[in-house]
């Protein structure tokens, strides 16, 4: 039961995390105009990975996409790549983990296969979370560097009298969303890996004790696993989902409304 809970929770946490990574990647507020210690402008600038926006005090917002690939900073390209890799890995991880969930029955999939799939998805979630955290952190580092550079020459003279205000950018909401989402995906991945250990079948051979029932012979083995008809043919600890006795982890063998959550 604990294994199922850990796996399910890992899946849900990762799902939330990946949704957050997608949201952060699409958000426009990766960097926002720093308003502290700045003359109050009637224009507010903010930038995302894909476009930059200007919100005027009149209430109008204008966004322009970065329609160039070669003209963009290498760091921005790297952040984009990390976030996309994170999303792709996370999406594949989600797909794999759906089939790996203990509460979902797919044919006669063995526990060992589910364990392997759980581990695979867990690793994918961990890498996905790390990619998102790395991407956001690279962008944050870029912002900090640019912030102090622009602070150093915040007011650049223009013809002596006139001053130009350098627009400084600080952390936008997307960075925090990305960090949290990456962390959740990472935690979800770790939980999946922990669940995998509980799912992995032990290679123990159990001695079969036969019970002769009238009519036809059905052998039951200790541990509550239903064996195939006959004696001792199913010596490995395999579960055959066609009714019979059930283990603690297998209380909902028959399809029910909870099977496809």
């Amino acid at each position: 039961m604990a294994v199922t809970a850990c796996q399910g929770l890992g899946f849900v946490v990762s799902l939330i995390g990946i949704a957050g990574i997608i949201a952060a990647t699409c958000m426009d507020q990766w960097s926002t105009q720093d308003l502290y210690n700045n003359p109050v402008t009637a224009v507010f600038n903010y930038q995302g990975l894909w476009r930059s926006c200007v919100r005027e005090s009149s209430g109008f917002t204008e966004c322009r996409g970065y329609f160039t690939l070669l003209g963009l900073p290498a760091m921005l390209q790297a952040v984009r790549a990390l976030m996309i890799v994170g999303i792709v890995l996370g999406a594949i991880g989600l797909l794999v983990s759906i089939f790996a969930l203990k509460c979902i029955r797919i044919g006669s999939m063995e526990d060992s296969a589910k364990a392997n799939m759980t581990l695979t998805s867990g690793i994918m979630f961990i890498v996905s979370g790390l990619c998102a955290i790395a991407g956001v952190s690279v962008f944050a580092n870029m912002l900090v560097t640019n912030f102090w550079m622009s602070t150093a020459n915040m007011y650049t003279g223009m013809g002596g009298m006139v001053q130009t205000v350098q627009t400084r950018y600080t952390f936008g909401a997307a960075l925090f969303v990305g960090w949290v989402a990456g962390g959740l995906t990472l935690i979800g991945g770790v939980m999946m890996c922990i669940a995998c250990r509980g799912l992995a079948p032990e290679e123990t051979n159990y001695k079969a004790v036969s019970y002769h029932a009238s009519g036809h012979s059905v052998a039951y083995k200790p541990g509550g696993f239903k064996a195939s008809t006959g004696f001792g043919s199913n010596t490995k600890n395999k579960k055959i989902y066609d009714g019979g006795a059930r283990t603690e982890d297998e209380v909902q063998s028959y399809p029910s409304k909870h099977d496809y959550v």
């Epitope: 009637a42 224009v43 005090s57 009149s58």
Partner: antibody
């Protein structure tokens, strides 16, 4: 587009409320600016109000002097001026705030004269 | 506050003449986010409210005759009337639309000879 109330003659210390009725556009979709013009000279921005949220912005000089309100049901913006002095004698305009932080539609202006 | 300085304060011209009005700002009005200059020009005819002519320093408002052209960047701006008409007799104001509080220039009065 913007129809303002008629001229006002007030005594010093009194208050006056100027109205500005909007028509022909979505009233709540645009902020409303208020501008002062003393004796036909330069223009002075007082501030603005967002009719949708009711948010107001005032210049330092007019804080405590001017108060903006709106009535969305009648698409009307109001500006109240308190504790009037001769300095407040001017023509007051309401103007729609649009793209580029511009004032694209203006009311015809309301003349306020403060005299004892 | 941003100081907007207009020159000349008044100008007497003949119909058909080309006119250039100047407006200088105490700080640059160029927004790095969209590379637009937040400077607006208004025309105020006698006894009338101001009328929007040009915004973003060079974008002509719809319905404004093509003879009105705005130019400049940063802190130096000009409004050019290629061929002055009788109906252009007015006061022209420039406005800082970038910094709070929004401030207007003192105006340039255009008079016909």
């Amino acid at each position: 587009q913007l129809q303002q109330s008629g001229p006002e003659l007030e005594k010093p210390g009194a208050s006056v409320k100027i109205s500005c009725k909007a028509s022909g556009y979505s009233f709540t979709g645009y902020k409303m600016n208020w501008v002062k013009q003393s004796n036909g000279e330069s223009l002075e921005w007082i501030g603005n109000i967002d009719p949708y949220y009711g948010d107001t912005t005032y210049t330092q000089k007019f804080k405590g002097k001017a108060t903006f309100t709106v009535d969305t049901s009648s698409s009307t913006a109001y500006m109240q001026l308190k504790s009037l002095t001769s300095e407040d004698s001017a023509v007051y305009f309401c103007a729609r705030y649009n793209r580029g932080n511009t004032m694209d539609y203006w009311g015809q202006g309301t003349s306020v004269t403060v005299s004892s | 506050d941003i100081v907007m300085t207009q020159s000349p304060s008044s100008l007497t011209v003949t119909a058909g003449e080309k006119v250039t009005l100047s407006c200088k700002s105490s700080q640059s009005l160029l927004n790095s986010g969209n590379q637009k200059n937040y400077l607006t020009w208004y025309q105020q005819r006698p006894g009338q409210p101001p009328k929007l002519l040009i915004y973003w320093a060079s974008t002509r408002e719809s319905g404004v005759p093509v003879r009105f052209t705005g130019s400049g960047s940063g802190a130096d701006f000009t409004l050019t009337i290629s061929s002055v008409q009788a109906e252009d007799l007015a006061v022209y104001f420039c406005q800082n639309a970038y910094f709070y509080p929004l401030t207007f220039g003192t105006g340039t009065k255009l008079e016909l000879r």
